[in-house]
Structures are given as structure tokens and as C-alpha cells.
């Protein structure tokens, strides 16, 4: 939970909590307004004082998530729950102290109260991860020409700082081509194009008065090699459709150099599948590169059965072709619940 | 309630200038980085430029940059753009939005102001 | 730049239906995705954000997945209201790229 001096407490959702499920012990000046959220959501949230759930209006409410004091009385000390509705589990369980002082800032202790110039009272706090969830993947390994972004977003009170390091070295990206983005706002690190003297350790490093603390990316830059095409395994995918329905047949590419696409169905003439070279006879549906807007999808519109059999998706880029094939199924509208779609396909590769 | 609202729009001519204005309120407006994104008739969205909270960080599309120049008044909760040197091309209806703490998705956004750039 | 491919362009749904939208990204954007709603005459609405959570007051049906290279918009029920072009956005890079739009229309 935080004690807010925010203005805007009906627009934003709370901060994230600094400790769920935990008992913590709160000091706070006689006279002094309190506004405390419970969690990030101000769903399903409500407040307790000494077992009896709080009224959402009055000079000591539980609204939206929020316990709101008007101003501090002796009589509000206690103990305070933030339940969830429903599971009604302890979210956060709190005591409130009264101390006719206002109480000076304790560095050992990042839980201890101050007053903001507008009488509100604000929690000061050491520095903590408020969405540890984007901070998961540890390792970045990514190809050459790409854009990294490390992310360490954070929060507490005073609003701490973030500096970066690599390899332990302060880190300002000045020797860097392209130089790199910093968004303080957003605790990011941003640096477009990586090349391999990008590699190393990445440290963010958030601190204010009452503590600091870091985390460490890795980042490896793979150099490309100059491939064909990669097509997804499994696609397109053989499809069984009903007469006058569409279809759509996926086909997804991966290449570096820029791709041409191709779709085409395969085709019979005077009775044969191959011409004399070996090859397949086939009609071009659709040619594209992979930039434009659908690319890699077939549709076929209200089919019939001449529009049953095979359908390949080629790729080529300057190194070499690759091309996977499905088979559209096209039933009488009567066998209508007999259609269904598998995901099996044939892959071949030519250099 | 968050209101933003552009205003400073209209027609000018090729190579001209043009400043916009987006005016704030319902927020404390210097906690927030804010962005413009424009829209040519009958087109896509075209994200333009963003600037931090505090004005530390800005960026721009490279469709914008040396010709546009975003900036903020905190003072006057308003944000501005700058355009100069205006392209046929730069004819789109400008909207300022405001980003979402920790995130960069736009969750409020002004009303739009159109800009016409023909000779 | 990063490049935001949609797909696909345009669509035609009854209400009731479910409706799909793909995003791709030309590279690893992590979750950093948001969908968008745009009603013609007005400013775009914000659907989803970071790939999966719903903006505050914006219908359950609207729901997003995906992370990395692929992201998918999913309206589970299509609702008379939802006729609209919607955009994909990545705030991945310093540059914030759009997808180019999808147009769901009535059948």
C-alpha cells in the first residue's frame, strides 16, 4: 500500500504495494489527512477497522480501494484490514499509531511517514521494483540490426533516481554509434541497430535517500547469417471447408533479406500433375513482398470444388527458395459438419 | 475528468510554419510524457513525437525530424509543436495524447486539429 | 524503424461473431503492444495495452494475447458498437509505430 499525496487519487490507480500480506506498524501526526491504497486495483478491495467493514462516506471512509482519513484523531488508531472481496483474504494489515510529532525521516527504516507541503501525508520508502513482471526475461540475445530496450521500472519516495551501467562502468552511451535513449519516466534504456561491442552486462541502478537497488540484463548481439526463407512449421495448415464459404490459408515467413512470396495451387494439364522437367504444374494466385499489408494470406472466397487441392507457399529471398504446400478439402454443403481444419504440412527447401 | 485540447490548426502554405497547441487539465500534467500522432485524411495513424514529464527526453518519426520541435509548459499544463517547413504531405489532423505511467499506450486523447498544407 | 504489419486490411463480421486481428511485429517487441479503436469523426480509444490488459472501462469481450513477434486482438462477441478500424501500436523503440489499421465492417 502507499500513503498518496497525489491530487489525482479518482483518475489513477493506486501505487503497487510495497509488501502484500505483511503486518506493518505506521506512525501518524495528530491533525494529518491519510490516504492509503490498497494494491493496484481499487476493485474488489474494501476496508476494515477492528473487524467492522468501513462506510464509503464520512471523515474516515473505505472507498474504491482507498482509506481515507479527513484528518487524524486519536480515536482512529488501530488496526486496519484491506480485504479481498470475495476470497476475502488479508491484502494488507495495518496499524496505526498517533504520535503528536511529526516523525523525522528514519534511514533505516523505509516505512516511516512525512508531511508534503500540502498537508497530505506520504509514505518515504526505499526504492522498489513496482512491475517486477517486465523484468523477467534476464538474457537478450538478439540479432545485429536490432533494437534493445531494458526496463527497470520502479518507484518509492523521494522518487528515486536510475543510472545504468556496463560491465560495472557507468554507462551514457556517448562511444556509442546511434547513442542510446534513456526515459527516466519509463526506467528504460533504449539503444536502436545493436552491433557485437553492444555485449555485456547491463546494471540499472535506482536509489534515493533511503536505499538503492539494481538489476542486471545480459545482452548478446547473434550476427546474421544470410539464410533462405524460414517458414513456420505447420503452415499453411490442410483445410476442409463447405462449398460458398471462405478460406483463408496462412503463410508465415521469417527472412532476413527481403522476401518475394508466391502462392500457388497446383494444377492438372492433359491428365498430368508434372511437366517433363519433373516439376509441378502450377498457376500463380497471388505474388507479394512481405511488407505489404497481407502478405502471407491466401483468401479464397466463397469456394467450390474446383478449388480443392493443393496450394504452396513459396519464398524467395537472394540466398535460396523455400515453399511448404497444404491441401484445401471442399465438401458438398450438405457434409457441412463433417469440416474441420488440421495442421499438417509438407516442407522442402531449395537452394 | 482529463481533457486535452488542440487548438492552432488550419491551412498554410508549402515550407511554411505552423505552432500547435494542446491545452490540459483534469491531471497533474508534469507527471506525464505526452505524445502527438497524426492521421492523413482517409489514413492510418502516424505516431509524431513524445516528450518526458519533465521536457528531459524527447524523440520524433523520422518523417518529423529537423522540422518539427515538441515542447511543454508545465506552468500552463499545455504542450506544443512546432512545425516548420511544412510538406503537402504533413496535411493530417494532429492529436496530442497523453502516455499511461509506466507504459507507452495512449489513454487519453484531444479531440484532433487539422492542418492543411497547399499552395 | 520497427515495422507493424496488420492483417487482415478490412473484414466483414455479424454481430455475434467472433472477430480476430493479427499483429506482427519485424522484430522482438517483448509485450510492448497496444490495440486501439477508431470510430470515424473521432480520436482513437485505447483497448489493450502492454499486449493483454484491458484499459479500465472498455467491455470484457475485447481481449489481446501474444508477446514477441505475434499479437492477436480478440472481440469475443461483436457488438453492434464495435464496427470500426482498429490499429495496433508498439512502444517498444523510441519511435512508436502503428500497424496500418483493420476496417471491421457489417456483413
Known amino acids: 500500500f502507499s500513503l498518496e499525496a497525489s491530487e489525482e487519487m479518482e483518475q489513477e490507480p493506486c501505487p503497487a504495494p510495497i509488501s502484500e500480506q505483511q503486518e506493518q506498524v505506521l506512525t501518524v501526526a495528530l491533525g494529518q489527512p491519510v490516504r492509503l491504497c490498497c494494491g493496484r486495483t481499487e476493485r474488489g478491495r474494501h476496508w476494515y477497522k477492528e473487524g467492522s467493514r468501513l462506510a464509503s462516506a464520512g471523515r474516515v471512509r473505505g472507498w474504491r480501494g482507498r482509506l481515507e482519513i479527513a484528518s487524524f484523531l486519536p480515536e482512529d488508531a488501530g488496526r486496519y484490514l484491506c480485504l479481498a472481496r470475495g476470497s476475502m483474504t488479508v491484502v494488507h494489515n495495518l496499524t496505526l499509531i498517533m504520535d503528536d510529532s511529526l516523525p523525522s525521516i528514519n534511514n533505516e527504516d523505509p516505512k516511516t511517514l512525512s508531511s508534503s507541503s500540502s498537508g497530505h501525508s506520504y509514505l518515504q520508502q526505499a526504492p522498489y521494483w513496482t512491475h517486477p513482471q517486465r523484468m523477467e526475461k534476464k538474457l537478450h540475445a538478439v540479432p545485429a540490426g536490432n533494437t534493445v530496450k531494458f526496463r527497470c521500472p520502479a518507484a518509492g519516495n523521494p522518487m528515486p533516481t536510475i543510472h545504468w551501467l556496463k560491465n560495472g562502468q557507468a554507462f551514457h552511451g556517448e562511444n556509442r554509434i546511434g547513442g542510446i535513449r534513456l526515459r527516466h519516466q519509463h526506467w528504460s534504456l533504449v539503444m536502436e541497430s545493436v552491433v557485437p561491442s553492444d555485449r555485456g552486462t547491463y546494471t540499472c541502478l535506482v536509489e534515493n535517500s533511503l536505499g538503492s537497488i539494481r538489476y542486471s540484463y545480459l545482452l548478446d548481439v547473434l550476427e546474421r547469417s544470410p539464410h533462405r526463407p524460414i517458414l513456420q512449421a505447420g503452415l499453411p495448415a490442410n483445410t476442409t471447408a463447405v462449398v460458398g464459404s471462405n478460406v483463408e490459408l496462412l503463410c508465415k515467413v521469417y527472412s532476413d533479406a527481403q522476401p518475394h512470396i508466391q502462392w500457388l495451387k497446383h494444377i492438372v494439364i492433359n491428365g498430368s500433375s508434372f511437366g517433363a522437367d519433373g516439376f509441378p504444374y502450377v498457376q500463380v494466385l497471388k505474388t507479394t513482398d512481405i511488407n505489404s499489408s497481407e502478405v502471407e494470406v491466401l483468401y479464397l472466397r466463397n469456394v467450390s470444388a474446383e478449388d480443392a487441392g493443393e496450394y504452396t507457399c513459396l519464398a524467395g529471398n537472394s540466398i535460396g527458395l523455400s515453399y511448404q504446400s497444404a491441401w484445401l478439402t471442399v465438401l458438398p454443403a450438405e457434409e457441412e459438419d463433417l469440416a474441420w481444419t488440421t495442421a499438417t504440412s509438407e516442407a522442402r527447401y531449395t537452394d | 475528468q482529463v481533457q486535452l485540447l488542440e487548438s492552432g490548426g488550419g491551412l498554410v502554405q508549402p515550407g511554411g510554419s505552423l505552432r500547435l497547441s494542446c491545452a490540459a487539465s483534469?491531471?497533474?500534467?508534469?507527471?506525464?510524457?505526452m505524445s502527438w500522432v497524426r492521421q492523413a485524411p482517409g489514413k492510418g495513424l502516424e505516431w509524431v513525437s513524445v516528450?518526458?514529464?519533465?521536457?528531459?527526453?524527447?524523440h520524433y518519426a523520422d518523417s518529423v525530424k529537423g522540422r518539427f520541435t515538441i515542447s511543454r509548459d508545465n506552468s500552463k499544463n499545455t504542450l506544443y509543436l512546432q512545425m516548420n517547413s511544412l510538406r503537402a504531405e504533413d496535411t493530417a489532423v494532429y492529436y496530442c495524447a497523453r502516455e499511461k505511467t509506466y507504459s507507452s499506450a495512449f489513454d487519453y486523447w484531444g479531440q484532433g486539429t487539422l492542418v492543411t498544407v497547399s499552395s | 524503424d520497427i515495422q507493424m504489419t496488420q492483417s487482415p486490411s478490412s473484414l466483414s463480421a455479424s454481430v455475434g461473431d467472433r472477430v480476430t486481428i493479427t499483429c506482427r511485429a519485424s522484430q522482438d517487441i517483448s509485450s510492448d503492444l497496444n490495440w486501439y479503436q477508431q470510430k470515424p469523426g473521432k480520436a482513437p480509444k485505447l483497448l489493450i495495452y502492454d499486449a493483454s490488459n484491458l484499459q479500465s472501462g472498455v467491455p470484457s469481450r475485447f481481449s489481446g494475447s501474444g508477446s514477441g513477434t505475434d499479437f492477436t486482438l480478440t472481440i469475443s462477441s461483436l457488438q453492434p458498437e464495435d464496427f470500426a478500424v482498429y490499429y495496433c501500436?508498439?512502444?517498444?523503440?523510441?519511435?512508436?509505430?502503428f500497424g496500418q489499421g483493420t476496417k471491421v465492417e457489417i456483413k
Open positions: 501500436q508498439q512502444h517498444y523503440s523510441p519511435s512508436h509505430t
Open positions: 483534469g491531471f497533474t500534467f508534469s507527471d506525464y510524457a
Open positions: 516528450i518526458e514529464g519533465d521536457g528531459s527526453y524527447t
